[in-house]
Interface confidence: low
Amino acid sequence: NFMYSKTVKRLSKLREYQQYHPSLTCVMEGKDIEDWSCCPTPWTSFQSSCYFISTGMQSWTKSQKNCSVMGADLVVINTREEQDFIIQNLKRNSSYFLGLSDPGGRRHWQWVDQTPYNENVTFWHSGEPNNLDERCAIINFRSSEEWGWNDIHCHVPQKSICKMKKIYI
């Protein structure tokens, strides 16, 4: 029976993910009952990704490790639309690490997932990045410019944003 075997497959996939995420929120994509996309509860979803705002204050390295334990990375922002979605879930008086760093301090910015760094799709605050000793990027709110990126020292604890691909079951 087709529906029965599909359900069994789904359940075994769910069990597989349960070790990382005890609870998943799934929605049916399109009209086909076969296509379910899931994000861990209480992550938020946008397009093909899931996002988690981590409110614990940690260094950039520890923040990335924290995301990876959950099967994610620090967030890689690819479009203005994606950033506009993310900022809806942020607090204006906080700063959040992005998955963007300049390990050598030579302004060779790189994303954690190896996505090519594209100058044309960056949202630095004006005058940023400005310090070669500040090798990690955050997103924060400035009253004059709304939300944008700033370079800071990687060891200074901040909140962070994790991103992972949606889970399809």
Epitope: G105, R106, G127, N130, N131, L132, D133, E134
Partner: nanobody, 123 residues
């Protein structure tokens, strides 16, 4: 604040070389990241190069990369700018600047400035 005095400027033909020096006094030199900036007539002062406190991290403006070399001698409280393959567009007054702790390209982050030394490159 640290006091800074530049020297080594002059007139040179295109393709030639000059070495600028900057002597620092008054404060612990190793507390300061150092930078070179320049200002051509009628233009704004612009970033040229900067170097970290230890000297391990130089950084350059794209326009001088591969031609200019910044270095420092912490034992002598000196910072240098070796300028090779000079071009007429390098003509400017060159300023040495000091900034507590942070290696940066931004003028407004530097709290101590020298008086400047004139570099003229003729074609």
């Amino acid at each position: 604040q640290v006091q800074l005095q530049e020297s080594g400027g002059g007139l040179v033909q295109a393709g030639g070389s000059l070495r600028l020096s900057c002597a620092a006094s008054g404060r612990t030199f190793t507390n300061y990241a150092m930078g070179w900036f320049r200002q051509a007539p009628g233009k704004e002062r612009e970033f040229v190069a900067t170097i970290s406190r230890s000297g391990s991290m130089p950084y350059y403006a794209d326009s001088v990369k591969g031609r200019f070399t910044i270095s420092r001698d912490n034992a002598k409280n000196m910072v240098y700018l070796q300028m090779n393959s000079l071009k007429p567009e390098d003509t400017a007054v060159y300023y040495c600047a000091a900034n507590v702790l942070v290696t940066t390209t931004r003028l407004d982050q530097y709290d101590s400035w020298g008086q400047g030394t004139q570099v003229t490159v003729s074609s």
